[in-house]
């Protein structure tokens, strides 16, 4: 029996509005009804939590009200969107998936998605 595999894209470029989206897919060894997804950011050797959501299979992901993350789920795929990103937020974003219920518990950690964020150039003043 192997660790639960979590797949995510290697690289994503955030939009000019600071929005990045990627898919986090997990190979579920069992029929989970309650799943927890956490997005972690690794910069240097530090890993910090970006956001987390627990959801019942078939239902929407619910992040905290002022979370910078939103997401939807479909089967064993979670579509994650991170908003409000700036150049300083460039880094490795790791998807962590936990099958919380029913037992047994499974934990899978992805290899991370490198998100590149480029701050837009300020618009030059125009005469119009």
């Amino acid at each position: 029996c192997k660790a639960m595999h979590v797949a995510q894209p290697a690289v994503v470029l955030a939009s000019s509005r600071g929005i990045a989206s990627f898919v986090c897919e997990y190979a579920s060894p069992g029929k989970a009804t309650e799943v927890r997804v956490t997005v972690l950011r690794q910069a240097d050797s530090q890993v910090t939590e970006v956001c987390a959501a627990t959801y019942m299979m078939g239902n929407e992901l619910t992040f905290l009200d002022d979370s910078i993350c939103t997401g939807t789920s479909s089967g064993n795929q979670v579509n994650l969107t991170i908003q409000g990103l700036r150049a300083m937020d460039t880094g490795l974003y790791i998807c962590k998936v936990e099958l919380m219920y029913p037992p047994p518990y499974y934990l899978g950690i992805g290899n991370g998605t490198q998100i590149y964020v480029i701050d837009p150039e300020p618009c030059p003043d125009s005469d119009f």
């Epitope: 029996c1 192997k2 660790a3 639960m4 060894p29 927890r36 956490t38 972690l40 530090q46 890993v47 910090t48 939590e49 956001c51 987390a52 905290l64 790791i94 962590k96 936990e98 919380m100 219920y101 037992p103 047994p104 518990y105 499974y106 934990l107 950690i109």
Partner: antibody, heavy 117, light 108 residues
């Protein structure tokens, strides 16, 4: 019932080595992340090593990196901690702990390491 | 490193008294777990996912909080609650965290 039984602790000289074992039973060992947590004489709890279910990924804090090696034998349902270049500050009670849905949900009774000069 | 600071380090309460201890995280986390450790025994998971009681935990215990600040409350102190309580993040990357320093609860 989940059962974790540590063994291998003892008195070791400064700079010496020791290997701890943890025999697991009562659950499907090969699907869980496992860890070693130590409790210092001052009663602080410190996570010193963790390993994923198939043994392919290991995690250590900087305090023990390069000196401690965690491993597992899923066929024997056993977790190990190889410790070398031991320091006085490594003296502690070492617990084997299972990382389940709600954090470290099962703990062994602990085995004591004393590093003497 | 996400540092967890528990306060107070030591406290004592009379039987029947309400007890609250806190755990502050230097970085935001979505959930917090609490462990109880009685003298000469192993730690036990006591409260998980911030507010859920582990199996066998009396209903006088409760947990609350969010982001950087969490707390454990005992509505009415009893002698069997004498122990040290440790917090540990329930989300984020578990194997890069340290436990809180603990709150030792004594009875008056």
């Amino acid at each position: 019932d989940v059962k974790l039984v540590e063994s291998g602790g003892g008195l070791v000289k400064l700079g010496g080595s020791l290997k701890l074992s943890c025999a697991a039973s009562g659950f499907t060992f090969n699907i869980y992340y496992m860890s070693w947590v130590r409790q210092t004489p001052e009663k602080r709890l410190e996570l010193v090593a963790a390993i994923n279910p198939d043994g392919g990924n290991t995690y250590y804090p900087d305090t023990v990196k390069g000196r401690f090696t965690i491993s597992r034998d899923n066929a024997k349902n056993t977790l190990y901690l190889q410790m070398s270049s031991l320091k006085s500050e490594d003296s502690a009670l070492y617990y084997c702990a299972r990382y389940g849905g709600p954090g470290f949900d099962s703990w062994g009774q602990g085995t004591t390491l004393t590093v003497s000069s | 490193e996400n540092v967890l600071t528990q306060s107070p380090a030591i406290m004592s309460a009379s039987p029947g008294e309400r007890v609250t201890m806190t755990c502050s995280a230097s970085s935001s986390v979505s959930y917090m777990h609490w462990y109880q450790q009685k003298s000469n025994t192993s730690p036990k998971l006591w409260i998980y996912d911030t507010s859920k009681l582990a199996s066998g935990v009396p209903g006088r215990f409760s947990g609350s909080g969010s982001r950087n600040s969490y707390s454990l409350t005992i509505s009415s102190m009893e002698a069997e609650d004498v122990a040290t309580y440790y917090c540990f993040p329930g989300s984020g990357f578990p194997f890069m965290y340290t436990f809180g320093g603990g709150t030792k609860l004594e009875i008056k």
